[in-house]
């Protein structure tokens, strides 16, 4: 056959679907690779062809669109499973072509099983709710296009294994789940089961997402430097190791980039000649407030190093702060016999 623009296996689109549920999968060509949509392509006389490679096989084969009850079908640029089976797992290819043009892309489809509590190998989207922030909602994801607007589905919400029924601060409202006041205890996996009829059959869509309750923007503050501070002086003799921790607290801020860095005499450590190492550790609170610690270390400090200015800087979307460490050279302890005796007036 003539040359075909092959976009390869699009592993960025690792599609996971539950066994025994409907799945509608759009050909990625029109979403990510080509500059025109399916309608334009179809009008121009291009045909969309689907085929697949089973899991652990090399052989590409056509998709069987003549299964009982049209279990697998194609509608425009969408491949439909009504429903999926476990052995539908494999790499699927959609190819757009006519006599003069050809373009194709493959993508992996994994059909997964869920257990009695909706646990599965499915990668779960995370939805962040602000703590004690007033009413917030999550919406049952990825259910558009499965049934017409004339069909009224039944929606059931679960937290973990349990149907959400008479919960204090969580109220199912159709496709939405409302949190009256989000608390840490609301952390967990939430599942919506959407049930709808189609051609005398009943289908279920199961969607699970993780809710994480995070710090509220109402309580957010600029970075707070706990160390260095005015109460601790780093007194060292030449030759000793100098260790200065910079510990910074960052309030949780959605999509904020938290940064901590040291300057030595106003320069980044990389830009000066002294042998300095910096080790960073990060910890998070239950509401995803962040504490970053950067330890500045000079193995064998010189008297010159002890005269330098060591400043810790921190920045978030809420602002920028800096704090200098108090570093000084240790005065040698007096030798008792001579110096102390002189002090007492001995001759």
């Amino acid at each position: 056959s003539e040359r075909c623009d092959d976009w390869g296996l699009d592993t960025m689109r690792q599609i996971q679907v539950f066994e025994d549920e409907p799945a509608r999968i759009k050909c990625p060509l029109f979403e990510h690779f080509l500059k025109f949509n399916y309608s334009t392509a179809h009008s121009a006389g291009l045909t969309l062809i689907w085929y697949w490679t089973r899991q652990d096989r090399d052989l590409e084969e056509p998709i069987n669109f003549r299964l009982p009850e049209n279990r697998i079908s194609k509608e425009k640029d969408v491949l439909w499973f009504r429903p999926t089976l476990l052995n539908d797992t494999g790499n699927y290819t959609c190819m757009l072509r006519n006599t003069t043009y050809c373009s194709k892309v493959a993508f992996p489809l994994e059909v997964v099983q869920k257990d009695s509590c909706f646990n599965s190998p499915m990668k779960l989207p995370v939805h962040k709710l602000y703590i004690e922030y007033g009413i917030q909602r999550i919406t049952c994801p990825n259910v558009d296009g499965y049934f017409p607007s004339s069909v009224k589905p039944t929606i059931t919400w679960y937290m973990g294994c349990y149907k959400i029924q008479n919960f204090n601060n969580v109220i199912p409202e159709g496709m939405n789940l409302s949190f009256l006041i989000a608390l840490i205890s609301n952390n967990g996996n939430y599942t919506c089961v959407v049930t709808y009829p189609e051609n005398g059959r009943t289908f279920h869509l199961t969607r699970t997402l993780t809710v994480k309750v995070v710090g509220s923007p109402k309580n957010a503050v600029p970075p707070v430097i706990h160390s260095p501070n005015d109460h601790v002086v780093y007194e060292k003799e030449p030759g000793e190791e100098l260790l200065i921790p910079c510990t910074v607290y960052f309030s949780f801020l959605m999509d904020s980039r938290n940064e901590v860095w040291w300057t030595i005499d106003g320069k980044k450590p990389d830009d000066i000649t002294i042998d300095v190492t910096i080790n960073e550790s990060i910890s998070h609170s239950r509401t995803e407030d962040e504490t970053r610690t950067q330890i500045l270390s000079i193995k064998k400090v010189t008297s010159e190093d002890l005269k330098r200015s060591y400043v810790c800087h921190a920045r978030s979307a809420k602002g920028e702060v800096a704090k200098a460490a108090k570093v000084k050279q240790k005065v040698p302890a007096p030798r008792y016999t001579v110096e102390l005796a002189c002090g007492f007036g001995a001759t």
Epitope: D20, Q113, T154, T156, K163, Q165, N166, H204, T206
Partner: antibody, heavy 119, light 107 residues
């Protein structure tokens, strides 16, 4: 189409045990819970418990906790309920029915197995 | 356990008549209720789920509704095959519980 096949009748002795079967077809057995329901002659329906075939997780009505044991055989798409230490009170029709995570209740029912406990 | 009180326990009605059966839940069940029909041969068929959603293949003369903790099944015009026993089932929380049943007889 969805079918849940149960044997018509079982005659058993007092004090013995009986294992009732429910063979599922026409759907993916491991994707739905299987429930069991009791109906004494001329009486109403009582929910005994359910089991999820994929991982054998069970829920029991406390009333039947020591009476019924639910199991599955995934290879034959069959659910079982064992009733132990049988008495005349256990004489009833036992139904199996499937449900999807309790989201819409029990949608398909077996024909029921009539258990008679008699010496 | 949630108690489901079903009324009436028996009902005599004529062909073409409109009848209503009611179930009252002892606790909030949030619409997690279905109606079942049991024929004299013991066959059980679900008619309605989620309080008001008609199962596929069930005639439109059957309908379900909710008013607070009261749930109703209405048959708009009785046909001969409708004479049977009817049960409500709450599946809001375990253990699931049934109403005591209504025997619908031909007058």
């Amino acid at each position: 189409q969805v079918q849940l096949q149960q044997p018509g009748a079982e005659l058993v002795r007092p004090g013995s045990s009986v294992k009732l079967s429910c063979k599922a077809s026409g759907y993916t057995f491991t994707s739905y819970w299987m429930d069991w329901v009791k109906q004494r002659p001329g009486q109403g329906l009582e929910w005994i418990g359910n089991i999820y075939p994929s991982d054998s997780k069970t829920h029991y009505n406390q009333k039947f906790k020591d009476k019924a044991t639910l199991t599955v055989d995934k290879s034959s798409s069959t659910a079982y309920m064992q009733l132990s230490s049988l008495t005349s009170e256990d004489s009833a029709v036992y139904y199996c029915a499937r449900d999807y995570y309790g989201s819409i209740g029990m949608d398909y029912w077996g024909q029921g197995t009539s258990v008679t406990v008699s010496s | 356990d949630i108690q489901m009180t079903q009324s009436p326990s028996s009902l005599s009605a004529s062909l073409g008549e409109r009848v209503s059966l009611t179930c009252r839940a002892s606790q909030e069940i949030s619409g997690y209720l279905s109606w079942l029909q049991q024929k004299p041969d013991g066959t059980i068929k679900r008619l309605i789920y989620a309080a008001s959603t008609l199962d596929s293949g069930v005639p439109k003369r059957f309908s379900g509704s909710r008013s607070g903790s009261d749930y109703s099944l209405t048959i708009s015009s009785l046909e001969s095959e409708d004479f049977a026993d009817y049960y409500c089932l709450q599946y809001a929380s375990y253990p699931w519980t049934f109403g005591g049943g209504t025997k619908l007889e031909i007058k």
